[in-house]
């Protein structure tokens, strides 16, 4: 049961850390103007991974995306590509952890197969989680230098009488979005893995072979003292092939009209 | 058609208070930035306040802020500036105005007449 | 606070010339998110409330003649009207839209001969 929990939250959690990364890479708000000098003004701006916007007091807010493929600073394009690597990776993990989820039985789809599939959505999801901390620390990393060279740039050139206002931007929304849903999708992978570890047959149980010598009737079972005495085995998750009695999360049915969602 | 029409002005001695009102029509009201612009007798157009859209910022000039009190009743289509401790250097000719693109302002009423004397 | 200084304080023309006032902001009025300038020009006809002609510097207000011409960038705009007529007699003004608070040009008065 606590096997079928973890797995279970383990989907839960990835699921909610995928719709996270979805959403941060959608939003506008990756950055935003920094308000420390002016905190009243009428022009807003703010930027996303594929455009930028401008909200007036007047509520009327324009947004032009970024045409340009070529003329995109390299980092940009990065975090871009680990972003929509993330959101892959989490889907394909999506779809396998779905046919890999211990509640939901497809034909006589074996423990060792669901247990192979947990890890494989598992570790989809470490990395999709990865991808996205990785994309939005690098876009955070940018932000920062950036905002100390246009700091830098707006104490220099005051000789005259004219004052040009550089925008500098700081986090935005998105980012704190990014890295909730990475580290959720993470925490889900990893949930699916402990998950894998108990769903994994420790070893394979064949039904007893007897063998009889003369003299002596000894029945002989592969898998050596472990095997034969039942102690450090893990019971519950061990297919026993013998016809023998099995446990509420053993029982294997055959397919309904309610197995298949 | 768009119109403004704003009342509630008049003569009020220093230190007084008053509230001017704005009944917008013609427009939906509540989709749009409101400000109060004011035009004193050497023809010098001053910004004296601005309410956003849902109402929940005001922004005002450091000459009025404290005094002057913007807001707005999108139910009854209005705008409201109440004035408090009035000064003489607030006689002036008010103005409501409506914020379009590029924050400037397309509406303006026909004005009401503020006079502070004692 | 942006300052906004308008020049000159008036004009003396005669119908049918072309007419150039100058504005100039103490702060640039660009906006780097969107390249525009948040400038608007105003002409109050005496007796009545200002009319907007231009906002974004140089977007026309509709309904406004084309002989209206608004342009620059930046610190300093400019206002032309390239063939004045009678009705264009007014007061123009410039304001600053792009931070609080908000600020007029003194306005330049427009004279017939």
């Known amino acids: 049961m606590a096997v079928t929990a973890c797995q279970g939250l383990g989907f839960v959690v990835s699921l909610i850390g995928i719709a996270g990364i979805i959403a941060a890479t959608c939003m506008d708000q990756w950055s935003t103007q920094d308000l420390y000098n002016n905190p009243v003004t009428a022009v807003f701006n703010y930027q996303g991974l594929w455009r930028s916007c401008v909200r007036e007091s007047s509520g009327f807010t324009e947004c032009r995306g970024y045409f340009t493929l070529l003329g995109l600073p390299a980092m940009l394009q990065a975090v871009r590509a680990l972003m929509i690597v993330g959101i892959v990776l989490g889907a394909i993990g999506l779809l396998v952890s779905i046919f890999a989820l211990k509640c939901i039985r497809i034909g006589s789809m074996e423990d060792s197969a669901k247990a192979n599939m947990t890890l494989t959505s598992g570790i989809m999801f470490i990395v999709s989680g990865l991808c996205a901390i990785a994309g939005v620390s690098v876009f955070a990393n940018m932000l920062v230098t950036n905002f100390w060279m246009s700091t830098a740039n707006m104490y220099t050139g005051m000789g005259g009488m004219v004052q040009t206002v550089q925008t500098r931007y700081t986090f935005g929304a998105a980012l704190f979005v990014g890295w909730v849903a990475g580290g959720l999708t993470l925490i889900g992978g990893v949930m699916m893995c402990i998950a894998c570890r108990g769903l994994a047959p420790e070893e394979t149980n064949y039904k007893a072979v007897s063998y009889h010598a003369s003299g002596h009737s000894v029945a002989y079972k592969p898998g050596g003292f472990k095997a034969s005495t039942g102690f450090g085995s893990n019971t519950k998750n061990k297919k026993i092939y013998d016809g023998g009695a099995r446990t509420e999360d053993e029982v294997q049915s055959y397919p309904s009209k309610h197995d298949y969602v | 058609d768009v119109k403004l029409v704003e009342s509630g002005g008049g003569l009020v001695k220093p230190g007084g208070s008053l509230k001017l009102s704005c009944a917008a029509s013609?427009?939906?009201?509540?989709?749009?930035?409101m400000s109060w612009v004011r035009q004193t007798p050497e023809k010098r157009l001053e910004w004296v306040a601005t309410i956003i859209i849902g109402g929940s910022y005001t922004y005002y000039p450091d000459s009025v802020k404290g005094r002057f009190t913007i807001s707005r009743d999108n139910a009854k289509n209005t705008l409201y500036l109440q004035m408090s401790s009035l000064k003489s250097e607030d006689t002036a000719m008010y103005y409501c105005?409506?914020?379009?693109?590029?924050?400037?302002?397309?509406?303006w009423g026909q004005g009401t007449s503020v006079a502070v004397s004692s | 606070d942006i300052v906004m200084t308008q020049s000159p304080s008036s004009l003396t023309v005669t119908t049918g010339e072309k007419v150039t006032m100058s504005c100039k902001s103490s702060q640039s009025l660009l906006n780097s998110g969107n390249q525009k300038n948040y400038l608007s020009w105003y002409q109050q006809i005496p007796g009545q409330p200002p009319k907007l002609l231009f906002y974004?510097?140089?977007t026309r207000e509709s309904g406004v003649p084309d002989r209206f011409t608004g342009s620059g960038s930046g610190t300093d705009f400019t206002l032309t009207i390239s063939n004045v007529q009678a009705e264009d007699l007014a007061v123009y003004y410039c304001q600053n839209d792009y931070s609080y608070p908000f600020t007029f040009g003194a306005g330049t008065k427009l004279e017939l001969r």
């Open positions: 974004w510097a140089s």
């Open positions: 105005t409506r914020l379009v693109k590029g924050n400037a302002m397309d509406y």
């Open positions: 013609g427009f939906t009201f509540s989709s749009y930035t």
